[in-house]
Interface confidence: low
């Protein structure tokens, strides 16, 4: 029998477009969590070590990567928008964290021993100085 | 929500680490505009969501398209949605 496997997400942060910054004086970071199954994720943005909610918009539910497949893997996107000056301050640190409530063969993903099969996965970016 | 000054634009974003994925951000469009799903199974497009920059009293609509296809381009990412031709902002090559 082909037992269903569980797949943790790959997480990547995409930096704001300089075109957006110059055009709007705002900067949007995008976080993508892709390739996960089942659809158990909780996404959060952290700026300088603190969770932020203002300026954040996350898909209300994960997207099936292959809608025709019943057991398709899922993706989720989120945006964080800040002022251009805040983005360009190199001291500012942005992190997208995706918590995955999946099931592993051996719990080796674990970072939190109280929840044996919780995985925290993150991707991050630093503010960019003008160059 | 009512978007005060819609300024629709599509921007290309760059991954913070070496990444095969290309991401296009469609943002600042009017609430009456709908974002269509891609007919290409290798191109993923999210539904529109609203972002609220509370400190700046600013709200914006947005949607994201991405793909691992090498020929994926932001100019065609939202081709199934009715958006103006002048919304595409090419990404200048970084000089950093």
């Amino acid at each position: 029998e082909d037992l269903k496997k569980v797949f943790p997400p790959k997480v990547a942060v995409f930096e704001p477009s300089e075109a957006e910054i110059s055009h709007t004086q705002k900067a949007t970071l995008v976080c993508l969590a892709t390739g996960f199954y089942p659809d158990h994720v909780e996404l959060s943005w952290w700026v300088n070590g603190k969770e932020v909610h203002s300026g954040v918009s996350t898909d209300p539910q994960p997207l099936k990567e292959q809608p025709a497949l019943e057991d398709s893997r899922y993706s989720l996107s989120s945006r964080l928008r800040v002022s251009a000056t805040f983005w360009h301050n190199p001291r500012n640190h942005f992190r997208c964290q995706v918590q995955f409530y999946g099931l592993s063969e051996d719990d080796e993903w674990t970072e939190d021993r109280d929840k044996p099969i919780t995985q925290k996965i993150s991707a991050e970016a630093w503010g960019r100085a003008d160059c | 929500p009512y978007i005060q000054n819609p300024d629709p634009a599509v921007y290309q974003l760059r991954g913070s680490k070496s990444n095969d994925t290309s991401v296009c951000l469609f943002t600042d469009f009017d609430s009456v505009m709908n974002v269509s799903q891609s007919k290409d199974s290798d191109v993923h497009i999210t539904d529109k969501t609203v972002l609220d920059m509370r400190s700046m009293d600013f709200k914006s609509n947005g949607a994201v398209a991405w793909s691992n296809k090498s020929d994926f381009a932001c100019t065609s990412a939202f081709k199934d949605s009715v958006i103006p031709a002048d919304t595409f902002f090419p990404s200048p090559e970084s000089s950093c």
Epitope: L3, K4, P38, D39, H40, E42, E70, D71, Y101, L103, K115, T118 | -
Partner: nanobody, 117 residues
């Protein structure tokens, strides 16, 4: 909030069988994974078996071929049929549910299984 109540534990001789039950209440339509775990005295809690909404199953190596996880959606119940029990199966057995909505992760209080001659 989901509540999980396990039952079916007890004392059994080596080679015997038991069937554990886990009844879920409240937001059961939001649950998309159930699991059975066990914790033996002095050891860490470990996975025994999982079942998803598509009734896809996944077993720990120690459970393969001996234990069967199943689900009765109409009764909001998940079962663990344990055959060919061994003394090393002695443990407190916990039911776990993973939900699509916060707080996502629910555990029952456990039911004790003792395998002894």
């Amino acid at each position: 909030e989901v509540q999980l109540v396990e039952s079916g534990g007890g004392v059994v001789q080596p080679g015997g069988s038991l069937r554990l039950s886990c009844v879920a209440s409240w937001d059961v339509h939001q649950i998309n994974f159930y699991g059975w775990y066990r914790q033996a005295p002095g050891k860490e809690r470990e996975k025994v078996a999982h079942i998803s909404i598509g009734d896809q199953t996944d077993y720990a190596d120690s459970a393969k071929g001996r234990f069967t996880i199943s689900r009765d959606e109409s009764k909001n119940t998940v079962y663990l049929q344990m055959n060919s029990l061994r003394p090393e199966d002695t443990a407190l057995y916990y039911c776990r549910a993973l939900s699509r909505i916060w707080p996502y992760d629910y555990w029952g209080q456990g039911t004790l299984v003792t395998v002894s001659s």
